[in-house]
């Protein structure tokens, strides 16, 4: 008996060939001997089967002795043995229809689980293997689960169903809803304007939801909400903003926030959460702000940084075009009785300057100038 695998919703063509290359009488029946279709001369006739409106044949092939049964919009329950009667012969074809669907939606939040469920006919024992867009293979039976979806899991998942040495391939497009970056860090001199951007890693026609930026300043004992907002069809509207700092928010995507000036009291880390309509759970992006200040008080030149810096970062004070006078893996450095000239405060990581602030030290009889 010939075995043919089909996909739910697809069209399948079951072949039936006579030895004579001409149009002769044929019938297709199911395992209950109920006629599906056949011919009467050059006319197609249909029987009382459930397939009535979905069954067809190709009249153009009859003259060549080919009498296919075409079943459109396949259903799992179409799985059956189909019998073609032609020239006093019976050709049997076993059709097995499979369906593979994602648990709920194919748009899932980062960190959520993807469950793929195989619908299969009774009595079948298929195996399934799926390959993710990043080349990860998962195997299973009726269900396959992938926990903690990552951004790289976005794309086409290719799943192969194996039964009776035959295989059928399914392609499922999965969109992982996430921010492009899980975390970002902004380095600013005191007084500079700060721009925070939160680009999304996906595009959808209509994006609706709401969000909040919750901030933990390094100097503060508790965290607080800096801004809350709504998103309607990609248009951003601010709901509530804290009075200090007075953040501004862009009206279009990508989500964009502006802090008028970087101040030590704002240095710290924030968490932007975004809830999307019809999705349970939220997207998160961490953002960090590091603020630098260089000051001269009497005979002491000081450079300080506030915010989440890594212990390997180096803070240095140097006179322009000279070697660093002081360089430490600390958040504050100073030079006593600095000589006159343009001093640079540098925050660097393995030699790469992340932040720089210049301060002009005048001869001792005058006051310092901050450029």
């Amino acid at each position: 008996k010939k075995v043919v695998l089909g996909k739910k919703g697809d069209t399948v063509e079951l072949t039936c060939t006579a030895s004579q290359k001409k149009s002769i009488q044929f019938h297709w029946k199911n395992s209950n001997q109920i006629k599906i279709l056949g011919n009467q001369g050059s006319f197609l006739t249909k029987g009382p089967s459930k397939l009535n409106d979905r069954a067809d044949s190709r009249r153009s092939l009859w003259d060549q002795g080919n009498f296919p049964l075409i079943i459109k919009n396949l259903k799992i329950e179409d799985s059956d043995t189909y019998i073609c009667e032609v020239e006093d012969q019976k050709e049997e074809v076993q059709l097995l229809v499979f369906g593979l669907t994602a648990n709920s939606d194919t748009h899932l939040l980062q960190g959520q689980s993807l469950t793929l469920t195989l619908e299969s006919p009774p009595g079948s024992s298929p195996s399934v293997q799926c390959r993710s867009p990043r080349g990860k293979n998962i195997q299973g039976g009726k269900t396959l689960s992938v926990s903690q979806l990552e951004l790289q899991d976005s794309g086409t998942w290719t799943c192969t169903v194996l039964q009776n040495q035959k295989k059928v391939e399914f392609k499922i497009d999965i969109v992982v809803l996430a921010f492009q970056k899980a975390s970002s860090i902004v380095y600013k001199k005191e007084g500079e304007q700060v721009e925070f951007s939160f680009p999304l890693a996906f595009t959808v026609e209509k994006l609706t939801g709401s969000g909040e930026l919750w901030w933990q300043a390094e100097r503060a004992s508790s965290s607080k909400s800096w801004i809350t907002f709504d998103l309607k069809n990609k248009e951003v509207s601010v709901k509530r903003v804290t009075q200090d700092p007075k953040l501004q928010m862009g009206k279009k995507l990508p989500l964009h926030l502006t802090l008028p000036q970087a101040l030590p009291q704002y240095a710290g880390s924030g968490n932007l959460t975004l809830a999307l309509e019809a999705k349970t759970g939220k997207l998160h992006q961490e953002v960090n702000l590091v603020v630098m200040r260089a000051t001269q008080l009497q005979k002491n030149l000081t450079c300080e940084v506030w915010g989440p810096t890594s212990p390997k970062l180096m803070l240095s004070l140097k006179l322009e075009n000279k070697e660093a006078k002081v360089s430490k893996r600390e958040k504050a450095v100073w030079v006593l009785n600095p000589e006159a000239g343009m001093w640079q405060c540098l925050l660097s990581d393995s030699g790469q300057v992340l932040l720089e602030s210049n301060i002009k030290v005048l001869p001792t009889w005058s006051t310092p100038v901050q450029p």
């Epitope: 709401s210 919750w214 503060a220 508790s222 607080k224 909400s225 009075q243 809830a275 939220k282």
Partner: antibody, heavy 119, light 107 residues
Framework: EVQLVESGGGLVQPGGSLRLSCAAS????????MSWVRQAPGKGLEWVAN????????YSVDSVKGRFTISRDNAKNSLYLQMNSLRAEDTAIFYC????????????WGQGTLVTVSS | DIQMTQSPSSVSASVGDRVTITCRAS??????LAWYQQKPGKAPKLLIY???SLQSGVPSRFSGSGSGTDFTLTINSLQPEDFTTYYC?????????FGQGTKVEIK
């Protein structure tokens, strides 16, 4: 530790006035919006009014508009509710709550003060 | 004003049971929804904010879901201290409004 303590409740005749106070401690009071919520005996919760950090924005439910006024004194870490033209249906426990939770949630509540309007 | 309708108004269950309370808003409120627990003679306590985020210190048996108009509070494996009243509240449009409450009773 965040603490909110209401006071000023009591028995008042219909048409009378009362001023409720809420003393806040354990957090930077001037950083938060604050709310009043009430609960009639055996009934559910009803949000009454709220006020922003510096008192420049105030919102209230229609049933108390023109009769109740919310205010705050950040120097004293205090929230107030001035209630005039009181009615029998205003009888309730009044809670002061901090809008300090994420997503505008009311994360800390006082123990409540009972206001009884009866002749 | 936005009407918040909770159902059921009361539910009987046993320790260890799973209980689901639903809250429906008369118009879309995105995820501006909180769930509170209130024990007799006590002030309400925040359980869930932003429709699905668990407030710090709240046991993980409590969970929230939904967005738009339909929301759910689920208590997995009810504990004796969970038999009390629960309220949903929207913070999308003034005036903030609460659901009428759901009482979880011992069967």
């Amino acid at each position: 530790e965040v603490q909110l303590v209401e006071s000023g409740g009591g028995l008042v005749q219909p048409g009378g006035s009362l001023r409720l106070s809420c003393a806040a401690s354990g957090f930077t009071f001037s950083d938060y919006w604050m709310s009043w919520v009430r609960q009639a005996p055996g009934k559910g919760l009803e949000w009454v009014a709220n006020i922003n950090q510096d008192g420049s924005e105030k919102y209230s439910v229609d049933s108390v508009k023109g009769r109740f006024t919310i205010s705050r004194d950040n120097a004293k870490n205090s929230l107030y509710l001035q209630m005039n033209s009181l009615r029998a249906e205003d009888t309730a426990i009044f809670y002061c709550a901090r809008e300090g939770g994420q997503w505008l949630a009311l994360d800390y509540w006082g123990q409540g003060t009972l206001v009884t309007v009866s002749s | 004003d936005i009407q918040m309708t909770q159902s059921p108004s009361s539910v009987s269950a046993s320790v260890g049971d799973r209980v689901t309370i639903t809250c429906r808003a008369s118009q879309g409120i995105s995820s501006w929804l909180a769930w509170y627990q209130q024990k007799p003679g006590k002030a309400p306590k925040l359980l869930i904010y932003g429709a699905s985020s668990l407030q710090s210190g709240v046991p993980s048996r409590f969970s929230g879901s939904g967005s738009g108009t339909d929301f759910t509070l689920t208590i997995n494996s009810l504990q004796p201290e969970d038999f009390t009243t629960y309220y949903c509240q929207q913070a999308n449009i003034f005036p903030w409004t609460f659901g009428q409450g759901t009482k979880v009773e011992i069967k």
